[in-house]
């Protein structure tokens, strides 16, 4: 029962985490214009992994995609790669874990197979979470480094030099979403790995024993029984786990140091 709950909870937590990683990857607010101790501007600049946006005081928002691939800095490419790898691994992990759930019956799949699948998905979730955390952390480090590189009329952003007034960027909402989502995916993966240990069947072979009942010459030979896990053909005390994860990801496209184009 505890194993089922752990596995189900791990799945739901990972599902939320991966949804969060996808949301963070798609969000435009990875870095946002630092408003503290800066001149009050009539525009608000913010940037994501795929495009940079400017929201004017009128509410008009204009976004420009980074249409170049070779012109983009290696660090940005690395962050993109880490987030995509995290999403792909997470998606595969989710697919595997669905079939590994104890509450879902697929043919005559043995518990050992389910245990292996649970472990596989757990490892995938852990790696996925680590990828997301690493990607977000690399970007955050990039922001911190660039934040202090400020001179009067020139900046060395992630995309080169432009003669312009210094615009400093700070952590955007996507970074926090990414960190939390990566953490949840990691926790979900650990829970799946823990559940795997409880799922793994222990092979216990009982040797044939002759029971001589008085007045009878009947020998009972039980043979090699597997330790019952409460599932298999025994449907007594079977509980279907219903994990309904609901995520509401609001991706806003509303406001340089990091003009990637």
């Amino acid at each position: 029962m505890a194993v089922t709950a752990c596995q189900g909870l791990g799945f739901v937590v990972s599902l939320i985490g991966i949804a969060g990683i996808i949301a963070a990857t798609c969000m435009d607010q990875w870095s946002t214009q630092d408003l503290y101790n800066n001149p009050v501007t009539a525009v608000f600049n913010y940037q994501g992994l795929w495009r940079s946006c400017v929201r004017e005081s009128s509410g008009f928002t204009e976004c420009r995609g980074y249409f170049t691939l070779l012109g983009l800095p290696a660090m940005l490419q690395a962050v993109r790669a880490l987030m995509i790898v995290g999403i792909v691994l997470g998606a595969i992990g989710l697919l595997v874990s669905i079939f590994a759930l104890k509450c879902i019956r697929i043919g005559s799949m043995e518990d050992s197979a389910k245990a292996n699948m649970t472990l596989t998905s757990g490892i995938m979730f852990i790696v996925s979470g680590l990828c997301a955390i690493a990607g977000v952390s690399v970007f955050a480090n990039m922001l911190v480094t660039n934040f202090w590189m400020s001179t009067a009329n020139m900046y060395t952003g992630m995309g080169g030099m432009v003669q312009t007034v210094q615009t400093r960027y700070t952590f955007g909402a996507a970074l926090f979403v990414g960190w939390v989502a990566g953490g949840l995916t990691l926790i979900g993966g650990v829970m799946m790995c823990i559940a795997c240990r409880g799922l793994a069947p222990e092979e216990t072979n009982y040797k044939a024993v002759s029971y001589h009942a008085s007045g009878h010459s009947v020998a009972y030979k039980p043979g090699g029984f597997k330790a019952s896990t409460g599932f298999g053909s025994n449907t007594k005390n079977k509980k279907i786990y219903d994990g309904g994860a609901r995520t509401e990801d609001e991706v806003q496209s509303y406001p340089s140091k990091h003009d990637y184009v």
Epitope: P39, A42, N45, V54, S57, G59, F60, V162, Q163, T164
Partner: antibody, heavy 120, light 113 residues
Framework: EVQLVESGGGLVQPGGSLRLSCAAS????????IHWVRQAPGKGLEWVAY????????YYADTVKGRFTISRDNAKNSLYLQMTSLRAEDTAVYYC?????????????WGQGTTVTVSS | DIVMTQSPDSLAVSLGERATISCKSS????????????LAWYQQKPGQPPKLLIY???TRASGVPDRFSGSGSGTDFTLTISSLQAEDVAVYYC?????????FGQGTKLEIK
């Protein structure tokens, strides 16, 4: 047709108060930020204040900060400028101007203006 | 505050000739986020409110004749009237649209020679 009509100007003594109004028509008022800009006699344009669509963002020129209050009533399609502690240097024609939506923050439509005279 | 300086203060040009007004800002009006310049030009005729001519340093507002053009980037901007017409007699103002408080140039009075 976009129209902005200012009213409420007049003669007021130094230290006195006045409330200017700007009635908007011909466009969805609640979709636009509005500015007050003034022009002293024979002088250039001076930006006074700005209020965003939903009144969440308000900015003032340093010369009027603490004395003037900009507000709006989207239900009435109206903009207001409450002026207190008026000084002689506040004498000017006051214009309300619409902040264009996709005009890089430029003011695309202006009212005809209302004259405020601060004199004893 | 951003200081906008226009030159000349007044300008007399013959009908059909080119008129050029310059505007300099104390800080760059180029927003690095979108590589756009936040500078506007206004025309004010006597007894009338200002009228938007150019925004974003070079984009003509709707209904503005194509003889009006804007150019420049960063801190240096220019308004050009390719062939001066009688109705172009007015005072022209440049304006910083990037930083609050929004600031105007002192104005350039354009007259016919």
């Amino acid at each position: 047709e976009v129209q902005l009509v200012e009213s409420g100007g007049g003669l007021v003594q130094p230290g006195g108060s006045l409330r200017l109004s700007c009635a908007a028509s011909g466009f969805t008022f609640s979709d636009y930020g509005i500015h007050w800009v003034r022009q002293a006699p024979g002088k250039g344009l001076e930006w006074v204040a700005y209020i965003s669509r939903g009144s969440s963002t308000i900015y003032y020129a340093d010369t009027v900060k603490g004395r003037f209050t900009i507000s709006r009533d989207n239900a009435k399609n109206s903009l207001y400028l409450q002026m207190t502690s008026l000084r002689a240097e506040d004498t000017a024609v006051y214009y309300c101007a619409r902040g264009g939506y996709d005009t890089r923050n430029a003011m695309d439509y202006w009212g005809q203006g209302t004259t405020v005279t601060v004199s004893s | 505050d951003i200081v906008m300086t226009q030159s000349p203060d007044s300008l007399a040009v013959s009908l059909g000739e080119r008129a050029t007004i310059s505007c300099k800002s104390s800080q760059s009006l180029l927003n690095s986020g979108n590589q756009k310049n936040y500078l506007a030009w206004y025309q004010q005729k006597p007894g009338q409110p200002p009228k938007l001519l150019i925004y974003g340093a070079s984009t003509r507002a709707s209904g503005v004749p194509d003889r009006f053009s804007g150019s420049g980037s960063g801190t240096d901007f220019t308004l050009t009237i390719s062939s001066l017409q009688a109705e172009d007699v007015a005072v022209y103002y440049c304006q910083n649209d990037l930083y609050y408080p929004l600031t105007f140039g002192q104005g350039t009075k354009l007259e016919i020679k």
